[in-house]
Every structure is written in C-alpha cells, then in structure tokens.
Interface confidence: low
C-alpha cells in the first residue's frame, strides 16, 4: 500500500537497518526509497534533541510485517519509502539549504559567485555527490564565496550540522542535467582496470550497469560473464572508480564486458528494472518465502507484489500430481543482488518487476493494440520504418524497426542490389505509403552495415544495421522496440505481430497501408518439416500457421516480428525469407535477433 | 547529411564587435553541442567556446569576457559574438559539431580579418 | 586550464613508414583524448576519440593509445594522403583545448 503522509512528531519503533544523514524528511524519503530493504524511516528534526549530533539523522527501518509501531516522539517525522507507490521515482533533488553544512569529504575547493554556481560545479564534476557554498558573508573572510566539492562512500553527508551563511545541495546528475560526457556503450572483450570501490553478483552486463548507474561512487565498471575462466569470479560485477574520472587503461579480455555509469546522462533516467528471466539459473539469497505458481511469469508477478521481494528463483515442477505447479522462491539480499548465481540448475531467476518506475523508453508502455482487423492504426506499431531507394525512381523497399535514437535494425537481403547509404531515406511514424510527399521528412542513412557471415537470406545471417545520419526525438508515432534479452533465449513468446506493407499474396503490389498479422511461433523442428531442402538453423525463427494464411510477404522483408512479454514489446524477429506467401506448413523464417544481440551491441555501442 | 556552414563579415575594424552565425542542417540543435574553433594564418587550432543542446555555454578562460555564443533552435543557426576586436583576432573561424566532446563535423570556416 | 603540447612541430617520414606522434597534458585528462587531421585549405577531420576510438570510416592504420598525461598517434603504414598537420586535444574538461600541432612531412 502507498503512503505518501509524513506523520509529524511519531516514530516509528524498532526495525533499524541503517542511519543516513539528510536535510529534511523528504530527502530522508528519498533516501530510504533508494535503498533496496528500507520500507519506512524516522527522520530527526532540531527540536527532536538536545544533542546536536542526533538532528539530520534519517534511521532506516525494516519490517516483516511492512509496518512497524508508531510512537509518540517530539521533533520526529516518520513515513514509508514510496516503492510502494505506483509513480515515477526519482533521486531528483534540487533544493538548497541554508545554514547547513553537510559533511563529507572535502575533495575539491574552488571559488563560486553563488550557491548555483557551485551546484553546476558538483554536478559537473564526476565525483561530487553534494556541496557546501560559503556565502560571502560567512564569519571567516578568507573562506567566503568557497564551494566546498563532497563526496562520501554512500553518497549521503556523513553528518549535518547547523552552520550560518553556508548553502548546503546535492549533484543534480540524477536530475539529467550533468555537462558531463555520457557513454552508454557496453564494450565486449573489454576490461577496466582501477579500483575496484564494490564487488555484486549480476546475470549480465546490463544489470551490472544498472547496479553501477545506482551505486553513488561506481563511474564504470567490469562484467565478468558466466564463461569467464576463474570459476569463482564468474558472473562478478566489479564497480569501480578513478580519480581522474575515467579508465586509466583497458585491456582485451575474452568473456568480460565493460561499460560506464550511466548516471550523469542526459534526458535519461536510470533504469532499475530487469524484466529478463534467467533460465537454468538460481538466484541466492535470503528466504523471504516460498509459494505455488504456476509459471516463472507468475513467481515474478508474485515478487513484484511482495513489497520486500528482490529477485526470484522459479523451480519447475517435476511431476503432474501438482497441477503442474512449481515453487516459487521470493529472496532478498543486503544490497538488492544475489549472494551467488548458480548455473545449469533447471530453475529459471529473474527481479522484481517493482522498480520498473524509471523510465526505459523502450520498455514505455504504448497505445493499446487494435484487436481484429488486418490494418494498422497510427503508433500502433511506433518502431516500424519503411525504408525507401531513391534510385532509380523512389519506392518502398523494405521495412525495419527502430532499435535506438540512431540506429535501425532490418534485414541484409534488402541489399543485395543497393549498396549506397545516400539512396536510401528512413520515414518514420507513417501509416500510409501515401502520407510520403516531396517535403515530408526523413532520416538519411550515413552506414550499411551488413552481418559479415551474410551470403543468401536462406543460410542466414540476414541481418543488417542502419546508422542514421541525424539522432531522432522519439514521439508517439516515432518510439523504439526493445532487443529480446540473452536471457529470454527460451522465452515462447505467446503474443507476435507481424507487419509490413508488403504483398497480400504473392502476385500483387505493395500496400498503402501498414498491414498486420498475429502469428504464432512454432519450433525449429517443426518449421524444418515444412523446408526439407533448407537448413533451419538457432539463428532463424518461424512464425505462422500450418494450415497456412497469415504471413509476410514480398515487401515486408526486414520489418520486425514484435512480440510481448512481461508488458514490453520486443523484437524477436526480421522478416527474412519463406516459400511463397501463407502457403500451408510453409511457415515465414525470421532472423532470431536474440542470437544477434551481442552483434548489434558490437556494432552499436562497441569502439 | 550533416552540414555546417559559417557566415561572417569578412573584414572588421579594430574595436569593432564580431557577428558569425553557424547554420545546421542533417541534424538538430537540441541534441548536440555546437564549438567554436579558430585557427589564425599559419597557426593552431584554438578552442574559443561552445553551447552545449540544451542551451548552457562554456568559454575558453581568456576570451571568456569578450565572447558571447547563443543559438536559435527553430532556424538551426548558433551565434558567436565577439566584442573590442584587435588584430590578433584574424583568424579563420569554425563551427563543428560535438561527439564525446570531440568534434566529428567541421564547417569550412569563414575567414576573419580585423584591419583599419 | 589544461595545457596540450605536442613537442614535435615537424616531423619527416617517408611512405610506407610508421610514426608515431605524440602529445602531453598539463594535467590528468586519463583517456579523453581526441586526434585531427588537418590538410591545407581544409577544415579538421576526426580521426580517434577516447584515446584509441576510430571515427566512422577511418582507415584501421590510425591508432591512438595512452592515458593520464602522456598520448601517441600513430600511423602504421604512411600514404602520401596523410601528409597533413595533426592536432591532439583534450575533451576531458571545458574549456577543452589543442595541442599546437605536429606537422607531417615528406623527407
């Protein structure tokens, strides 16, 4: 339940896990919301004591129960931690206070005009996590007009004390308002040396940057994969610093994967939300309890209603006699991450789903599929492109997906006589091939990059990459697809969509407008049956129906299979290849994108 | 594609302010930072400033008081102002584009002569 | 202020050569460090950023290594193309700053 009152003079008793330093209760709020086991606080005004050293104190609490006895206490202001509440969290703080100094370590002293200088210097500089600023009528004439730059190992004063015409703030990197460079890149086969501030267990380099993006000393960090050769460091997250900010040096390391803090980026908050499952994988950690479910799906929808769940491990049932119920085993940890990640245990691990309150565009939930019907409405599918040559004379020819701001994902067979980025145009949010004027604007394409193993789209390996020359804003009409999760490898996704203005059937002309089909998946096996002469390889997917019907067609090649999952749409599939259109057991094949993951990240993000 | 063009006066009296105006295209403003750069006859490159997408500015120190860089968004233009010119401000001056604080396109510059 | 110096102002190879350029910060910049090439009448071009980060379509002979204080450039296979005046410059704090420039010559 979401309490969002501030009970003034009560406290609550009992159930401490930590004590911070913070300004004010709301801040104290902030603070417990951020921390992955506190459920309620008791924050310590001046009035609450006559010992200066308890004022500011912001005591983190616990709770089995998730509530704990309130007490009568002057001066004291209790409230809970709003991971119970449904709205957007945010570390966000912008306010200044007067008259307080909040301590840390004073790493970097300089002069400022004001208060706000001296914040843009803390959120500028890579370090700071908060700042004192003299005024120039502080006591001490020599100190005025200093902007102390602080930080702490927890990111939060290690004390607060009253201390008149000083301005006490914190960074607003969490606000997005950093000038500091933001690299998002994930590098393969990467290690960075420097200091190693935290060690936690992680499934995989994203949350591991997720885990680093949160940690208020992490500027980068070392992702050893669950092949890394030392058995006992596999899956380690290794969080690191350095003074100067950077990686003072990098190596080549085979099964390890680098990558930045992404917590000075702009116009993005971070995201600490991973909806991936974790298949042959337990996750350990503290019992909190274990029920019935039916699925792994429903083991996490039952840890992201345990307001105390962290991560789960999902065990399948091996006999019948249960309904075919498994076990599921709600954790949690010290630090939100599992103690130790077990392989090869036939359970499947996953997070909760509670923190999912930061927005990921692509994870952004989007207007609501129109059901029935074979044509497309506006924003329905946002990610969708029509890929346009302009030579000879200017006409659709293919589809594509948007996976990034720069960057669109379709097949490589569309180029196999177009070899030119300057004739080709991206047009996005269209419905209608007819909307296409003169004037409407597009996106150049600035780079082709073909899968270098890409010969026919029958071998495989028929995939390609478009770097657009200019970033896109995203809109409503103009929004970008998730990539499945290496994690979601054996995900059966129940829900897919083909769409494309291609072909109704085989003799005919491309369609004005965005056409769709739901398709089902179905096994490698099974499509196999229906292509004896071709080799259906992991790298492919296929979708349609045996009796046949529904499917792409000529002109819908490289458009996207989209499917959802957990509430989030991901691009499981590229049109590629299929004999004839909707012919019975002559299924449409796919580029199975899971298996492209760590290509696209190479070639998107990678040096 | 991206493009960025510098438009001056050419040739301006010492004291005299400075007016270059850097037109975009290929991309918008409110995603990138924009730098003014400015290389004398025969010397280096000097860093003169730079407005960051969503309008904040940087300086280079010792120009810091003379310089003024602005933009309009809607006509994909930047501003660089210059005030109390002399004549060791004749230089060839550039706009360029941001990546990772690197600048990965250049306009061809537009030529400076502060004379009598 | 950071100060970038590049010592050499000139420097002589021949085709085929490998040279290798280099350039000193004032201060600890650790790996943000970008390297331009500059032919007459031009305007810059991005050769690497982040020290050793290829720009799109840049020919795999540029490679830039180094961090803290101390950077190289270096060609391994000199063309007659790349002939030019480089620039290194610091893009780790504004005001970002050039080193003064090395310029490549046919000896």
């Known amino acids: 339940e979401c309490v969002t009152t501030l009970f003034q003079d009560a406290c609550f008793k009992g159930g401490d896990i930590t004590v911070a330093f913070a300004p004010n209760a709301k801040h104290c709020q902030i603070i417990c919301t951020h921390h992955p086991r506190c459920l309620l606080f008791t924050f310590m005004t001046e009035s609450s004591s006559e010992d200066p050293t308890k004022w500011y104190t912001c005591i983190l609490k616990d709770s089995v129960t998730e509530t704990l006895p309130m007490v009568n206490m002057t001066g004291a202001i209790s409230g809970y931690s709003s991971k119970q509440c449904l709205h957007h969290i945010s570390a966000c703080s912008k306010d200044m206070y007067v008259d307080l100094n909040m301590k840390g370590m004073n790493y970097n002293s300089s002069l400022a005009q004001s208060a706000r200088e001296c914040q843009q210097r803390c959120t500028d500089d890579t370090h700071c996590h908060f700042f004192t600023f003299a005024t120039r009528h502080f006591p001490s004439i020599k100190d005025r007009n200093t902007c102390l730059l602080k930080n702490t190992q927890t990111g939060t004063p290690t004390s607060i004390t009253k201390l008149h015409e000083v301005v006490s703030g914190f960074s607003l990197k969490s606000c997005g308002l950093s000038n500091l460079a933001c690299i998002r890149d994930i590098f393969p086969r990467t290690a960075f040396v420097d200091i190693t501030i935290d060690t936690v267990m992680a499934p995989d380099p994203f949350v591991c940057r997720s885990i680093c993006t949160h940690h208020p000393s992490c500027l980068f960090f070392t992702f050893l994969s669950e092949e890394w050769p030392t058995a006992s460091e596999r899956n380690l997250c290794l969080l690191k610093t350095s003074s100067s900010g950077l990686p003072s040096a990098r190596f080549r390391k085979n099964r390890a994967f680098s990558g930045f803090s992404l917590q000075h980026c702009q116009h993005s908050v971070p995201v600490f939300c991973h909806s991936s499952f974790y298949r042959n994988t337990d996750f350990l950690g503290e019992e909190l309890d274990i029920v019935d479910a039916d699925s792994h799906e429903a083991c996490q929808k039952t840890c992201t209603n345990s307001i105390r769940c962290q991560f789960f491990t999902y065990s399948p049932s091996q006999e019948s006699c249960n309904g075919g119920k498994g076990k599921c085993y709600l954790k949690l940890s010290a630090n939100g991450s599992p103690t130790k990640i077990l392989h090869g245990t036939g359970s499947i691990s996953g997070y909760t789903l509670r923190l999912c309150k930061m927005d990921n565009v692509c994870t952004t939930k989007i207007k609501t599929r129109i059901v029935g019907g074979t044509q497309s409405v506006h924003g329905e599918w946002p990610w969708q492109i029509t890929l346009h040559v302009t030579s000879p004379t200017q006409r659709h020819l293919c589809g594509g997906a948007i996976i990034g701001n720069q960057w669109i994902l379709t097949a490589a067979h569309c180029f196999n006589e177009v070899k030119s980025p300057n004739v080709l145009r991206v047009y996005s949010g269209i419905l209608n091939q007819s909307e296409i004027k003169e004037d409407t604007s597009f996106f150049g394409v600035q780079e082709i990059i073909i899968h270098d193993q890409y010969e026919k789209a029958e071998s495989g390996y028929d995939i390609a990459l478009l770097k657009l020359e200019t970033a896109m804003n995203y809109t409503d009409s103009q929004w970008p697809i998730c990539l499945p999760s290496k994690g979601d490898r054996n995900v059966m996704y129940t829900e897919c969509w083909v769409t494309g203005w291609g072909y109704r059937k085989l003799r005919d002309k491309i369609q004005n407008t965005l056409q769709k089909a739901k398709v089902p998946l179905m096994t490698n096996e099974e499509c196999q049956a229906g292509y004896r002469e071709h080799r259906i390889t992991s790298k492919m997917v296929c979708a349609g129906y045996r009796e046949g019907g529904k499917d792409a067609c000529k002109g819908d090649s490289g458009g996207p299979l989209s499917c959802k999952h957990n509430e989030v749409w991901h691009l499981v599939g590229i049109t590629s290849w299929g004999e004839g259109c909707g012919q019975r057991e002559r299924p449409g094949v796919y580029s199975n994108v899971v298996e492209y993951v760590d290509w696209i990240l190479e070639k998107t993000q990678g040096p | 594609q991206v493009q960025l063009e510098e438009s001056g006066p050419g040739l301006v009296a010492p004291s005299q302010s400075l007016s270059i105006t850097c037109t975009v295209s290929?991309?918008?403003?409110?995603?990138?930072?924009i730098y003014w750069v400015r290389q004398p006859p025969g010397k280096g490159l000097e860093w003169l400033g730079m407005i960051w997408g969503d309008g904040r500015t940087d300086y280079n120190s010792a120009l810091k008081s003379r310089l003024s860089i602005s933009k309009d968004n809607s006509k994909s233009q930047v501003f660089l102002k210059m005030n109390s010119l002399q004549t060791d401000d004749t230089a060839r001056y550039y706009c360029?584009?941001?990546?990772?604080?690197?600048?990965?396109?250049w306009g061809q510059g537009t030529t400076l002569t502060v004379s009598s | 202020d950071i100060v970038m110096t590049q010592s050499h102002k000139f420097m002589s190879t021949s085709v085929g050569d490998r040279v290798s350029i280099t350039c000193k910060a004032s201060q600890d910049v650790s790996t943000a460090v970008a390297w331009y090439q500059q032919k007459p009448g031009q305007s810059p071009k991005l050769l690497i950023y982040?020290?050793?980060y290829r720009n799109t379509g840049v020919p795999d002979r540029f490679t830039g290594s180094g961090s803290g204080t101390d950077f190289t450039f270096t060609i391994s296979s000199v063309q007659a193309e790349d002939l030019a005046v480089y620039y290194c410059?610091?893009?780790?704090?504004?005001?970002?700053?050039f080193g003064g420039g090395t310029k490549l010559e046919r000896l």
């Open positions: 982040l020290t050793s």
């Open positions: 410059q610091q893009h780790y704090k504004t005001p970002y700053s």
């Open positions: 360029a584009r941001d990546y990772y604080g690197s600048k990965d396109y």
């Open positions: 290929g991309f918008s403003l409110t995603g990138y930072g």
